[in-house]
């Protein structure tokens, strides 16, 4: 179906968990576009009024970023062109847990997907041989 004269595109996310104090990844992929300048990535968090992160015209656009994410977010800029909109979240905090939306605009259309992000003090399971 059409959205503002464009089609919807497929956006895929994967629920994940982050270790407090470490860096985490919020995974998101989309149907790639041939022109980086036509791609807009917005990450939003439920209940947070500023943006988590925005990437447009080939670079970060953080003027509307919420202060709780200041200096802690990055996309993999060199991988956006191949459809990777995943977000790196530095120094994960307990309050980072919640529902995130990965919203994508390309020349092909728009799409979004939600993901649940859990935070905690997780440890790698020990494997005894």
């Amino acid at each position: 179906f059409g959205i503002s004269g464009r089609h919807s595109i497929t956006v895929t996310t994967v629920a994940s968990a982050g270790n407090i104090g470490e860096d985490g990844i919020l995974s998101c992929t989309f149907e790639p576009d041939i022109k980086l300048s036509d791609i807009v990535i917005q990450w939003l968090k439920e209940g947070v009024l500023g943006l988590v992160h925005e990437f447009k015209e080939g670079k970060d656009e953080l003027s509307e970023q919420d202060e709780m994410f200041r200096g802690r977010t990055a996309v993999f800029a060199d991988q956006v062109i191949v459809g990777n909109a995943s977000l790196r979240l530095k120094n994960v905090q307990l309050t980072d847990a919640g529902t995130y939306k990965c919203y994508i605009i390309t020349s092909k259309g728009k799409g979004n997907a939600n993901l649940e992000y859990k935070t905690g003090a997780f440890s790698m399971p020990e494997v005894n041989v």
Partner: antibody, heavy 116, light 107 residues
Framework: QVQLVQSGAEVKKPGASVKVSCKAS????????MYWVRQAPGQGLEWMGR????????VYAQKLQGRVTMTRDTSTSTVYMELSSLRSEDTAVYYC?????????WGQGTLVTVSS | DIQMTQSPSSLSASVGDRVTITCQAS??????INWYQQKPGKAPKLLIY???RLQSGVPSRFSGSGSGTDFTLTISSLQPEDFATYYC?????????FGQGTKLEIK
């Protein structure tokens, strides 16, 4: 157009409390934070804190912690700022302002005079 | 808290003059700075946000620049209605502190 309309001037005695309202119109009330800023006579602007109209979560300036309370009523698109244990140095014009990282627009201001 | 040091605190200028007001942050705030104009008895009005972006409806004679810790508001050619007090504000980290203000007066 986006508008913030504040309640009228107040005169209070030291030790009393005051509650100032700020009614928003012309936009989605829950889409942006509401901030409070005050200005003592002839002085500069002082950030007091903010409220998230969606969740009711607040952040207050440290020097006002324990005396200031910000609340909201989503049914009337109104935020409130209550300041207790008033002293003479709280005499100021109190402004509400909408925003995320910049404030626009601002309410017209509410003069609160604390005098015995 | 992040301190914002604004200078000068007052300034006398004439219509047509080019005027520059500076603001220095006590730490790196990237481009999270805003500029407001306030006239006596009125609420502040947003002029510039995100260091250099002109708010809708604000005349193009106003401009902002800078990044990191040092920022500038410039009025390219002063008009009679520009005589007012100007404030910078950082929005990098709460509390979103203001500079102490610059009063722009007619010479």
């Amino acid at each position: 157009q986006v508008q913030l309309v504040q309640s009228g001037a107040e005169v209070k005695k030291p030790g009393a409390s005051v509650k100032v309202s700020c009614k928003a119109s012309g936009y989605t009330f829950t889409a942006q934070y509401m901030y409070w800023v005050r200005q003592a006579p002839g002085q500069g602007l002082e950030w007091m804190g903010r409220i998230n109209p969606t969740s009711g979560n607040t952040v207050y300036a440290q020097k006002l912690q324990g005396r200031v309370t910000m609340t909201r009523d989503t049914s009337t698109s109104t935020v409130y700022m209550e300041l207790s244990s008033l002293r003479s140095e709280d005499t100021a014009v109190y402004y509400c302002a909408r925003g995320i990282n910049w404030f626009d627009p601002w309410g017209q201001g509410t003069l609160v005079t604390v005098s015995s | 808290d992040i301190q914002m040091t604004q200078s000068p605190s007052s300034l006398s200028a004439s219509v047509g003059d080019r005027v520059t007001i500076t603001c220095q942050a006590s730490q790196d705030i990237s481009n999270y700075i805003n500029w407001y104009q306030q006239k006596p008895g009125k609420a502040p009005k947003l002029l510039i946000y995100a260091a250099s972006r002109l708010q809708s409806g604000v005349p193009s004679r106003f401009s902002g620049s800078g990044s990191g810790t040092d920022f500038t508001l410039t009025i390219s050619s002063l008009q009679p209605e520009d005589f007012a007090t100007y404030y910078c504000q950082q929005s990098y980290r709460s509390p979103f502190t203001f500079g102490q203000g610059t009063k722009l007066e007619i010479k």
